[in-house]
């Protein structure tokens, strides 16, 4: 049994780091493998992660962490029984993938303005709370070409757009994702999408 693709890990910078790797053949990850992880700190305790299958030869492990600070560094040991298959290290602050925003809501009752709001996925005491910026994706269910991205570079988790920038009388969907420039993170996953029917009064044309 050998590791074909070494583990790569990302942290949500809160409580979970996710590591993925590939074996050289079909593997029952949960029965055959264990990923041990340990904070590099005097007298820190080793923890065991039981991996799950992620495709035939792929494995994924969700490492539970108390919290994360920039100084943290973890050692990682991948074991198959008594055999050490791979040894490495992981600094969560250097591999951050933020949590996805939640509770995306479209408010359509504000005159002819659409107000999209969502929740910051971090609690106020987490470093990322005040460092997230967002991308909002809006698309038409009827017209695949009607697809747009709005970059929200301010901290408030909301976006206002004129309803008239979208077509009237058809259904749209929206979703949002986050990233943090301070840690050069990857983008989060997209939030679940939300759907609404776009309708607004066309301005009365005078001739």
């Amino acid at each position: 049994m050998k590791v074909l693709q070494e583990p790569t890990c990302v942290s949500d910078y809160m409580s979970i780091s996710t590591c993925e790797w590939k074996m050289n053949g079909p593997t029952n990850c949960s029965t055959e493998l264990r990923l041990l992880y340990q904070l590099v700190f005097l007298l820190s305790e080793a923890h065991t992660c039981i991996p799950e299958n992620n495709g035939g030869a792929g494995c994924v492990c969700h490492l539970l962490m108390d919290d994360v600070v920039s100084a943290d560094n973890y050692t990682l040991d991948l074991w198959a029984g008594q055999q050490l298959l791979w040894k490495g290290s992981f600094k969560p602050s250097e591999h951050v993938k933020p949590r996805a925003p939640g509770n995306l809501t479209v408010h359509t009752n504000v005159s002819d303005t659409l107000l999209l709001t969502w929740s910051n996925p971090y609690p106020p005491d987490n470093y990322l709370y005040n460092h997230l910026t967002y991308a909002v994706n809006i698309w038409s269910e009827n017209d695949p070409a009607d697809f747009r991205i709005y970059n929200v570079t301010y901290l408030e988790p909301s976006l206002r757009i004129a309803a008239s920038t979208l077509k009237s009388g058809i259904s749209y969907r929206a979703r949002v994702r986050a990233w943090a420039q301070c840690y050069n993170t990857t983008w989060s996953e997209w939030s679940p999408s939300t759907k609404w029917h776009n309708s607004y009064r066309e301005p009365f044309e005078q001739h």
Epitope: F41, L42, L43, S44, E45, A46, H47, D66, V69, D72
Partner: antibody, heavy 118, light 107 residues
Framework: EVQLVESGGGLVQPGGSLKLSCAAS????????MHWVRQASGKGLEWVGH??????????YYADSVKDRFTISRDDSKNTAYLQMNSLKTEDTAVYYC?????????WGQGTTVTVSS | AIRMTQSPFSLSASVGDRVTITCKAS??????VAWYQQKPAKAPKLFIY???TRHTGVPSRFSGSGSGTDYTLTISSLQPEDFATYYC?????????FGGGTKVEIK
């Protein structure tokens, strides 16, 4: 919210024994090492000893001043750490704190007072 | 055992002052130094570890620095709630050892 509550302190004669308890809540107790630290009145902090988690085979470490007299144990099912103190001396008189160890001693109990006097 | 020598033993300062406390280890402890604050009749609280990393909830006016054997805790602008005793500790090796403490008093 992480909470540590010590109990079991009191007055004991030199040569006597006492067992302190530290009840933990608000975190997964079994995953953390636990320390005991003491402080004589008006003095500084003195590390007493430490017990590691099951993943480290419940290894224990002690300060030279208490070695062979004090024993640290834990019961993960009760979320409790213990400090068994035997052959107590007057110089063991202090407030005893239990602390969680993660990145240093990140949470402390309120302390329990042990007085060794005849 | 590694000895941690803290200075000064005590100091008097006013609100708004910049305060510096030093700790010298008897050998290189590779930035494995923590700082604790203790108020009268209360348990100590962790403020800094790894020499410079603030613990959750610790105000930014507290900063730690140092390397090798010499470490410093700085309070950039002393506030009324900062009057307390501060202890350094090495977390480089067992036995864990503390400095003797520095009492910060109101001038």
């Amino acid at each position: 919210e992480v909470q540590l509550v010590e109990s079991g302190g009191g007055l004991v004669q030199p040569g006597g024994s006492l067992k302190l308890s530290c009840a933990a809540s608000g975190f997964t107790f079994s995953m953390y090492g636990m320390h005991w630290v003491r402080q004589a009145s008006g003095k500084g902090l003195e590390w007493v000893g430490h017990i590691r988690s099951k993943s480290s085979n419940y290894a224990t470490y002690y300060a030279d001043s208490v070695k062979d007299r004090f024993t640290i144990s834990r019961d993960d099912s009760k979320n409790t750490a213990y400090l068994q103190m035997n052959s107590l001396k007057t110089e063991d008189t202090a407030v005893y704190y239990c602390t969680r160890w993660f990145r240093a001693m990140d949470y402390w109990g309120q302390g329990t007072t042990v007085t060794v006097s005849s | 055992a590694i000895r941690m020598t803290q200075s000064p033993f005590s100091l008097s300062a006013s609100v708004g002052d910049r305060v510096t406390i030093t700790c010298k280890a008897s050998q290189d402890v590779s930035t494995a130094v923590a700082w604790y604050q203790q108020k009268p009749a209360k348990a100590p609280k962790l403020f800094i570890y790894w020499a410079s990393t603030r613990h959750t909830g610790v105000p930014s006016r507290f900063s730690g620095s140092g390397s090798g054997t010499d470490y410093t805790l700085t309070i950039s602008s002393l506030q009324p709630e900062d009057f307390a005793t501060y202890y350094c500790q090495q977390h480089y090796s067992t036995p864990l050892t503390f400095g003797g403490g520095t009492k910060v008093e109101i001038k």
